[in-house]
Each structure stands twice: as structure tokens, then as C-alpha cells.
């Protein structure tokens, strides 16, 4: 389809991307799937400016982003290179902590109450943010 010129209803435009902020919680895999159903992806943070934008909209609430290490190395869901890209981890994070008693470590990244990142158990029901790039989106709005 042709490129989208503006964001769908209830999405927020910022720097040629559209963002949707959930108000309920889901496990990381469900949040990831929701964004894909909407022809989007969990938010990929590529700069301090984008970090501040997202942080402003989510407030001091644990919120999933599109970063995980479920298959070994840390990966962004859209293929953005993790090693050379922007990072904003809390001190001592990620730590793949096993002491939570839920089985396994911590493989999914989220914004914490101060905006910095932490790795946590992917099954926790956190809010999430979807992102889609205007230049990549099709003309039709996502299914609602």
C-alpha cells in the first residue's frame, strides 16, 4: 500500500512515528502480539529524545518495550542493532535475576517508574507501547 500520511485515531505522532499507549497490562508476548496485530511493533527506543517522549506519556508506570533476550543476546523487535544503539538501563541492570521464584530469569525489558530500563519476567502484566513508522505504514488504518 501507499505510505500513511498521518497516524490512526488514538495514536500519537512524534518524529515520523506513531505511538499507541496501553492503559491495561499484558504479558510481553501478548503485548508484542497486540502491536503486530495492529501492523506495528513494541516501541524501539533509538535516542534520548525518543526516550523522553515515551517517558512523558507513560508516567511512572512499568511499561514493556520491544527489547528482549529470550533467544540469547538482547534484540530489538524491529532488528535495530542493540550493541551500537541507545541504552538507558538502571544501574546493575540487566541482571537476569533468578530470585523472583517464578522460574527462569528475566528476558524482557521495560521502562521503570523513573524511565530507566530493567529486565523482568516476561509474564508480568505490564502496560506497553506500540510504534509504527509513518513511512512504512500502509494507507489503511489498523483493525480496531
Amino acid at each position: 500500500g501507499s505510505e500513511r500520511t498521518c497516524c490512526p485515531v488514538n495514536w500519537v505522532e512524534h518524529e515520523r512515528s506513531c505511538y499507541w499507549f496501553s492503559r491495561s497490562g499484558k504479558a510481553w508476548a501478548d503485548a508484542d502480539n497486540y502491536c503486530r496485530l495492529e501492523d506495528a511493533h513494541l516501541v524501539v527506543v533509538t535516542s534520548w529524545e525518543e526516550q523522553k517522549f515515551v517517558q512523558h506519556h507513560i508516567g511512572p508506570v512499568n511499561t514493556w518495550m520491544g527489547l528482549h533476550d529470550q533467544n540469547g543476546p538482547w534484540k530489538w523487535v524491529d532488528g535495530t542493532d542493540y550493541e551500537t544503539g541507545f541504552k538507558n538501563w538502571r544501574p546493575e541492570q540487566p541482571d537476569d535475576w533468578y530470585g523472583h521464584g517464578l522460574g527462569g530469569g528475566e528476558d524482557c525489558a521495560h521502562f521503570t517508574d523513573d524511565g530507566r530500563w530493567n529486565d523482568d519476567v516476561c509474564q508480568r502484566p505490564y502496560r506497553w507501547v506500540c510504534e509504527t513508522e509513518l513511512d512504512k505504514a500502509s494507507q489503511e488504518p489498523p483493525l480496531l
Epitope: D30, P142, L143, L144
Partner: antibody
Amino acid sequence: QVQLVQSGAEVKKPGASVKVSCKASGYTFTGYFMHWVRQAPGQGLEWMGWIKPKSGGTNCAQKFQGRVTMTRDTSSSTAYMELSRLTSDDTAVYYCARGGATVTTWGVFDYWGQGTLVTVSS
Amino acid sequence: DIQMTQSPSSLAASVGDRVTITCRASQDISNYLAWFQQKPGKAPKSLIYAASSLQSGVPSRFSGSGSGTDFTLTISSLQPEDFATYYCQQCDSFPLTFGGGTKVEIK
């Protein structure tokens, strides 16, 4: 009436790939999600993934990531599922099933294809 | 992943019997549950969605109930064409998962 008609049975060697088709009729193909489900001989049902025909967007179960490719041709209202690096464990009947039209009903199936038997044997 | 556990795995019943099949989810799925019927060599047929809503064309002797983690499929008066395997499926969480099936056989 809604119909999902699948391609015929296939016999493949281990390591090969198979591509199964599912031709939809009787409804607007781009208005509903399409799913793929498989069933090994004498076993239960196993969900593989979905495709959104309108955009071509997909998602699949982690078990199949990197091995399954779901595509569609809107001009012929046909969905395709390709599974690569086949092993004997992939011997199964593969079904397409129509999902819902929205992000809240995406996982609700109403119509199923007749199934395609894929046999993997050396 | 959410595990779906069906019981019994098989049962024998007679025409006219009331048959009840249960399905338990490993976590709360609200009413995001469907039931399917499958006969040997055939594709599954959708019976019930949203735990209790009948798919179009499904006889009213089939009914579903439950919410949260515990669900039931009831056939009020078993007919000869109802001898089949029945599956539940949760459609709440990714990935979608099915129960192991319940085979309803002739007594």
C-alpha cells in the same frame, strides 16, 4: 458461503521445505485474520501462527520462529504457509482456519480448511 | 504459555445421554474460550466461542459455560452424529493453545 480450500497432500524428504496453500472464497479475504494449525497423526491440535491478509503482517509461535513463513496473495484470496528444514516430527495434517476481523477476535476461529497431509520421510 | 487441561480424556455414552466435558486453564482467561468438534479424518468444526456463544448452525443441544479458569461443554441429549473428539482452545493469550481433547465414544 465461506469456504477454505487447501492444496493436496505432499511427501517431503527431511531437510526440505513444503508450501501449503489455502484459497478463501465467500467473504472478503482481507477482512479477517487467517491462522495455521497442525495435527500430528493421532495427536491434538497445535497452533502455528497468523497472517493479516490486508497488510501481510504475521506472527507465529516461538516453536516455529525462523522456520515458518506465512504469506498471502490478495488477488487470488489465497494464504500460504511454508515450513522449512522439515523433520519426521513435522509429519501432520496442516489446517488453515479463519480468525476474527478485529484485534479482540483475532484468535477466534469459525471456518476451517479441509486439511493438507504433509508426510516427511526419507 | 497457558496450559489447557481437558477431562476426561475419553468417555463412553449412549444416545440420549447428557454429556459434560470440562476444560481448565492454567491461568485466568476470562471468557476467551472456544470448543471444537472433530470427527476422524475430518477438519475440526467450530461449536462455541466466548465460552458460551454458539457458532451459527450449531444445534442448541450444545452449550458452554464457565469463566476464569474452569469451563464446561455440555451436550444435553447425545445424538449419533455427536460421537467425536472435542477440543477446547484459549483465545486470550499468545500463543493460542488447545486442550488435549476428549473422545466421546459409543457405550
